[in-house]
Interface confidence: low
Amino acid sequence: KLTIESTPFNVAEGKEVLLLVHNLPQHLFGYSWYKGERVDGNRQIIGYVIGTQQATPGPAYSGREIIYPNASLLIQNIIQNDTGFYTLHVIKSDLVNEEATGQFRVYPELPKPSISSNNSKPVEDKDAVAFTCEPETQDATYLWWVNNQSLPVSPRLQLSNGNRTLTLFNVTRNDTASYKCETQNPVSARRSDSVILNVLYGPDAPTISPLNTSYRSGENLNLSCHAASNPPAQYSWFVNGTFQQSTQELFIPNITVNNSGSYTCQAHNSDTGLNRTTVTTITVYAEPPKPFITSNNSNPVEDEDAVALTCEPEIQNTTYLWWVNNQSLPVSPRLQLSNDNRTLTLLSVTRNDVGPYECGIQNELSVDHSDPVILNVLYGPDDPTISPSYTYYRPGVNLSLSCHAASNPPAQYSWLIDGNIQQHTQELFISNITEKNSGLYTCQANNSASGHSRTTVKTITVSAELPKPSISSNNSKPVEDKDAVAFTCEPEAQNTTYLWWVNGQSLPVSPRLQLSNGNRTLTLFNVTRNDARAYVCGIQNSVSANRSDPVTLDVLYGPDTPIISPPDSSYLSGANLNLSCHSASNPSPQYSWRINGIPQQHTQVLFIAKITPNNNGTYACFVSNLATGRNNSIVKSITVSASGTSPGLSAGA
């Protein structure tokens, strides 16, 4: 069947369209195109005779049409009037006619649209805005874009006038956006330039910053005000209701208490005509003076004086605080605070009370600290120490003794030999000593401030021969498996070798034995009863040697588990029972007996004459060592059989 296809169907003005013929019959004479849906000679566009290949224009020919041998018709430079139906009339060789109709539509190329607005400066929450997409074009579709997105769903947005008009009711600041409109028809689409909606709003309630409301006298007050507003707000400041200035910031240097009050920021929008205010209350506090500490005694004497520290100045209704060594006050019966905390009293000062001490005045905002104060506690002198500790010297060496005593102020020192004053120095030096330099060497330390003096006496022996040494012990009665014992070989002598013997033998190798202090001290750790031996120390130098008398270590031990003898446990009725208890112990233990749990006698031997079966039972021996504080016991069962019964068998067997 003969058909016409329009390519394209929708044609833009100025473009071209091809009316393409399909299923054209064979053996044709010719064909003719007509404008409209029927063959009408008045509306013939063009005719074509195949035999002559001659095209003949008709009344409707415009000069823009071209006919092709295959009967297709090309129309160029299309105009709006070309819209409609076109009919092809085919004349076959047998002069039988055939017709087919096609159509196309012509649309204009759309111009770039623009947006008109009925209100260029709408006011928030008050005005509506109507945007209209220009120009009005027939057969065009209108679309809208907000920030390049399609329109959101909102009851405040309304499309009308065939979508050509977009109305925003009750505009808000959030409606400030980029708006575009778009026109579309089947042959073109065009978008407008952006229109930015300028919504007037505010001012909102202003915010005053910083949020600080409390200031100290002498600080700078710098307040800034901001309110959301379009156009930007104009600002005014009021203090206690009095106008100050029309600026966004308020600056007052070096404020005083008089600057306390209510500070109001007023924001004004000239376009909306609205005003909003915010009030902040500023409090300026007087800066209290820096506190300082006074003392009733600048040089207290240890263990004699009390010291009262007072925090100045005195201010009514003020809290006073104290610190010692950067810590809050320790709980101590020697520290007393007055009712108002302003005075801290140290009863009976010690050298450890030097401080530093700080007091603080608490004001409304913080705590002001005083400078630290250190107490000059006078103390001492303590007992002087003479060094070195040697007491024996060989002739010909130099004697150099030094004296020191803890003291504030530092002690003044004097040396005496055999009671005779020598010199007022801390050190005593005698070169090339002889036996005549032997004697009592006294160091005297004197504190001029407290008036106190202390002395220490040291015996110095100058001899070529070493003295007979002796052994001192730090524990005369050590307890086994508990105590350690340190033996020291006396005296301490210069350039001397110290040696030790146990039971006449040199020291055994043992982890429990340790030599120290130049071999002068022998320590026995965790003593045992086997350490109860004779200990001898010896000293020697290049010209002599000597040994101490032996010292026997008295190790306290026990009591060990006691043994009851004889070992028999079966007796015949009528025999005598004579039990003896023994336990290894130093010192000897105390003994006691119990029969069937009942206390008997405090003896080592238990004797019962002519026993009977009534004496059957448990016999317990208890031992106690009062020196070690330890106890022990053992239990023995005794069975007494009737006469004539074999021991160990029950009656009637």
């Epitope: 910083p210 600080n212 409390s214 409090t283 603080g360 409304e364 913080s366 705590v367």
Partner: nanobody, 119 residues
Amino acid sequence: EVQLVESGGGLVQPGGSLRLSCAASGFNIKDTCIGWVRRAPGKEEELVAAICPYIGETRYADSVKGRFTISADTSKNTAYLQMNSLRAEDTAVYYCATVARKYNQYNYWGQGTTVTVSS
């Protein structure tokens, strides 16, 4: 320059816990009082807790007593607010501020941290 920086806010379910921190610089917190102030839309500003480290004093708003604990670590110059058994009405922006002990007035403020209590 005095600065207070809060942290530790967030979203928590009712009954949950949060611990807010306030790091101070430019001054010693042992010499002043530090408070936690909260602001919620439509509610009055509320001082929920304050601590004066130099005298060991703490105080709490009735609405948080027994649930919130304020503390201070003077060695770290930091104050803390431990918030337990949180409720929806505790939702607010929490600010750390220096507090005048005798008056509920604030001198220096942090920028705030948001606490949201919601299931």
